[in-house]
């Protein structure tokens, strides 16, 4: 049994880091493998992650972490029984994938304006809370070409757009994702999408 693709990990910079790797053949990850991880810190304790299958030869492990900060560094040991298959390290702050925003809501009761709001996925005491920027994707269910991205570079988790910038009388969907420049993160996953019917009063034409 050998590791074909070494583990690569990303952290949500809050409580979970996800590591993925591939073995050289079909593997029952949860019964055959264990990923041991330990913070390089005084008094830290070793933890064991039981991986799940991720395709035939792929494995994924969700590492639970407390109080993640930029100085943290973890040692990782991948074991198959008594055999050490791979040894490495992981610094969460250098491989951040933010959590996806939640509670995306479209408020259509403001005159001729669409107000999209969502929730910041981090608590106020997390460093990322004040450092997320967002991308909002709006698309038409009827017209695949009607697809647009709005970059929200301010901190408030909301976006206002004129209803007239979208076609009237058809349904649209929206979703939002986040990233943080300060840690050069990847984009988060998209939030679940929300749907609304866009209708507004066309201006009277002479």
């Amino acid at each position: 049994m050998k590791v074909l693709q070494e583990p690569t990990c990303v952290s949500d910079y809050m409580s979970i880091s996800t590591c993925e790797w591939k073995m050289n053949g079909p593997t029952n990850c949860s019964t055959e493998l264990r990923l041991l991880y330990q913070l390089v810190f005084l008094l830290s304790e070793a933890h064991t992650c039981i991986p799940e299958n991720n395709g035939g030869a792929g494995c994924v492990c969700h590492l639970l972490m407390d109080d993640v900060v930029s100085a943290d560094n973890y040692t990782l040991d991948l074991w198959a029984g008594q055999q050490l298959l791979w040894k490495g390290s992981f610094k969460p702050s250098e491989h951040v994938k933010p959590r996806a925003p939640g509670n995306l809501t479209v408020h259509t009761n403001v005159s001729d304006t669409l107000l999209l709001t969502w929730s910041n996925p981090y608590p106020p005491d997390n460093y990322l809370y004040n450092h997320l920027t967002y991308a909002v994707n709006i698309w038409s269910e009827n017209d695949p070409a009607d697809f647009r991205i709005y970059n929200v570079t301010y901190l408030e988790p909301s976006l206002r757009i004129a209803a007239s910038t979208l076609k009237s009388g058809i349904s649209y969907r929206a979703r939002v994702r986040a990233w943080a420049q300060c840690y050069n993160t990847t984009w988060s996953e998209w939030s679940p999408s929300t749907k609304w019917h866009n209708s507004y009063r066309e201006p009277f034409e002479q």
């Epitope: 008094l43 304790e45 407390d66 109080d67 900060v69 930029s70 100085a71 005491d125």
Partner: antibody, heavy 116, light 111 residues
């Protein structure tokens, strides 16, 4: 919100021991390390040691080795610092502080006076 | 513990900018991250800056931190009378043992 509430002021005789408590609330107690530091009157801050509330393991500043003991009670989310063989120079305000590499939140402090 | 040296006192008028230095050895400041604490008269210390330059939520951006080599600096702009306090730098050291030294402390007086 996070709160670290410490026990009240103590007056002790030289050679005695003192045990200071720090009750934590507003966060997952076992997820954060706890430091202890002290401050003698008119002096600066001095680090004493650290405890991991999850397993109870401890590490102490060399200056206090053999005299200090840090413990925790997870059922009450409380950490304790006991200092023995007290001398007059141990008169200080003792603080607990939550954190790992730095101290996010500090207790209100406990004044320990050592006097004959 | 390793010694982190700060000036005993600094002073400036309201609205001005003041800086407080913190110098230490390569095994402490040089290899780790610096934090800064504010201690108002009669109160417990409070975290102002961590990780060299990050502010906890609720700390105004008038406070900033910077580290270069084996020294660090706390800068306070737009001084207010309420900033009059003692300021301590802090870090951690892993050699030969883990420990958390604090700076000698600086008394800030707002004139």
């Amino acid at each position: 919100q996070v709160q670290l509430v410490q026990s009240g002021a103590e007056v002790k005789k030289p050679g005695a021991s003192v045990k200071v408590s720090c009750k934590a609330s507003g966060y997952a107690f076992t997820s954060y390390y706890m430091h202890w530091a002290r401050q003698a009157p008119g002096q600066g801050l001095e680090w004493m040691g650290i405890i991991n509330p999850s397993g109870g393991s401890t590490s102490y500043a060399q200056k206090f080795q053999g005299r200090v003991t840090m413990t925790r009670d997870t059922s009450t989310s409380t950490v304790y610092m006991e200092l023995s063989s007290l001398r007059s120079e141990d008169t200080a305000v003792y603080y607990c502080a939550r954190g790992k590499y730095w101290m996010y939140d500090w207790g209100n402090g406990t004044l320990v006076t050592v006097s004959s | 513990l390793p010694v982190l040296t700060q000036p005993p006192s600094v002073s400036a008028a309201p609205g001005q900018k003041v800086t407080i230095s913190c110098s230490g050895g390569s095994s402490s400041i040089g290899n780790s991250y610096v934090s800064w604490y504010q201690q108002l008269p009669g109160a417990a210390p409070k975290l102002l800056i961590y990780d060299n330059n990050k502010r906890p939520s609720g700390i105004p951006d008038r406070f900033s931190g910077f580290r270069s080599g084996t020294s660090a600096t706390l800068a306070i702009t737009g001084l207010q009378t309420g900033d009059e306090a003692d300021y301590y730098c802090g870090t951690w050291d892993t050699s030969p043992v883990w420990e958390w030294p604090f700076g000698t402390g600086t008394k800030l007086t707002v004139l």
